[in-house]
Amino acid sequence: EEELQVIQPDKSVLVAAGETATLRCTATSLIPVGPIQWFRGAGPGRELIYNQKEGHFPRVTTVSDLTKRNNMDFSIRIGNITPADAGTYYCVKFRKGSPDDVEFKSGAGTELSVRAKPSAPVVSGPAARATPQHTVSFTCESHGFSPRDITLKWFKNGNELSDFQTNVDPVGESVSYSIHSTAKVVLTREDVHSQVICEVAHVTLQGDPLRGTANLSETIRVPPTLEVTQQPVRAENQVNVTCQVRKFYPQRLQLTWLENGNVSRTETASTVTENKDGTYNWMSWLLVNVSAHRDDVKLTCQVEHDGQPAVSKSHDLKVSAHPKEQGSNTAAENTGSNERNIY
């Protein structure tokens, strides 16, 4: 009679993570008598996957009933496959022996490859905010995918970016891989509403790429422009001075009025108006009693925006002259006001 052969018909099997892998194995003879065992890997460090004779293998089921005397199908199914299950599986026939069974013949092996989806890309921006015209870096990370081939693209508001570097790790063979990409983005004053998108395409995603986003509102700081103007008032001895704080983001802003270098009032921006580009405007009024001043008054509007060093704009108030409109003739924008009278 022809000597028993162990047939593993599939050289390779490709399974998606979470699915069940079927590893086929048949013997050509019932002789010699003895159990079948499945191993992952070869040599002394091989890992036992299934033993027909004894042991508990909760993830493994047999395709046919191995208790039947004439059974020659030793195929198994491994459930809930993960990338860690990847490797070459060997179906090995043992001959009954005393005290231990003896390895008789091995199949040629079946390589199990696991297709694993990449994790949702996580996009992170710089730790500190940056101002327009500065270049900032964004990173995108995705993990746990297999096979290694993957495509990553960057977009800003739908426009593809080209200034980025991408690495897939590890370089050699692995059960799963990670991708890390860094993109450089130049900020503009209009970027409060902008988004940066990292898009990952992989064979497991069936043409539906994964996206991670970052809002540039978390990254950008648009410094305010200040304008101090003197408004005409009805009362002869009172002058209304306004400080218009325009086009700033984020909202965190403290304004201080100084009269001849002395603090008159500080207030935090609360009732702001929002521009179409996402920046804010705010207006603060200071009502100055001119009769209380014998000399000219230097009024300073000082603004501390988003934890940055203070910026200021000054206006010289001539007390000798009759109060009249001075300063900019720029039309006032639709801004909120925060009026407090100072006497």
Epitope: A127, A128, R129, Q251, R252, Q254, T256, V263, T266, E267, T268, S270, Q302, E304, D306, G307, Q308, P309, A310
Partner: antibody, heavy 115, light 110 residues
Framework: SLEESGGRLVTPGTPLTLTCTAS????????MGWVRQAPGKGLEWIGI?????STSYATWAKGRFTISKTSTTMDLKMTSPTTEDTATYFC?????????????WGPGTLVTVSL | AIDMTQTPASVSEPVGGTVTIKCQAS??????LAWYQQKPGQRPKLLIY???KLASGVPSRFSGSGSGTEFTLTISGVQSDDAAAYYC????????????FGGGTEVVVK
């Protein structure tokens, strides 16, 4: 980590410079601050040096203290200490390039101003 | 200028109890508030920032709430290790400020 040095016993009016040294931390991209604590008292803010090098001080500290920095150190110069300046002085790093919260603190250095 | 007022100055609570510390800003600081813990002879430690976000490694029994001018630090199920001084700090602005910190609250655990 951050570590303060330079704290010692000085007589009133003797200028003193405290140094905050960073190891494994780059100070150039962060705002830094000095905070002090008199014995048995609460925390008292002295001032900030922004990532760009600008400074801002507590109203009571203007003219009495000067803050400067390099990429790895920050100095606090006490121009003319008084007995009221006896305290433990902490340096701390903010979470960003501007003023916000103190993310990292040094262990403190004790300054005693006494006749 | 923004002034920070912290209450109470001292509080005593048995193990397992709840400690509540309040902090009031003289004007709106949105959510720009942090809480620090300081044990005797040690440096302060950031507990909570942005009024309610837990700093890295801080136990979940610490929580922060509030916005605008009124803020609260709560220690639920207080433990003996929580005995310390606690300080609030406004992170909004520093121009013409006398002190960015509240006066502190001493927590005694019985």
């Amino acid at each position: 980590s951050l570590e303060e040095s330079g704290g010692r016993l000085v007589t009133p009016g003797t200028p003193l410079t405290l140094t905050c040294t960073a190891s494994g931390v780059d100070l150039s991209n962060y705002a830094m601050g000095w905070v002090r604590q008199a014995p048995g008292k609460g925390l008292e803010w002295i001032g900030i040096i922004y990532a760009g090098g600008s400074t801002s001080y507590a109203t009571w500290a203007k003219g009495r203290f000067t803050i400067s920095k390099t990429s790895t150190t920050m100095d606090l110069k006490m121009t003319s200490p008084t007995t009221e300046d006896t305290a433990t002085y902490f340096c701390a790093r903010h979470r960003s390039d501007g003023y916000d919260y103190f993310h990292l603190w040094g262990p403190g250095t004790l300054v005693t101003v006494s006749l | 200028a923004i002034d920070m007022t912290q209450t109470p100055a001292s509080v005593s609570e048995p193990v397992g109890g709840t400690v509540t510390i309040k902090c009031q800003a003289s004007q709106s600081i949105s959510s720009w508030l942090a809480w620090y813990q300081q044990k005797p002879g040690q440096r302060p430690k950031l507990l909570i920032y942005d009024a309610s976000k837990l700093a890295s490694g801080v136990p979940s029994r610490f929580s922060g709430s509030g916005s605008g001018t009124e803020f609260t630090l709560t220690i639920s199920g207080v433990q003996s290790d929580d005995a310390a001084a606690y300080y609030c700090q406004q992170g909004y602005a520093v121009s013409y400020v006398e002190n960015i910190f509240g006066g502190g609250t001493e927590v005694v655990v019985k």
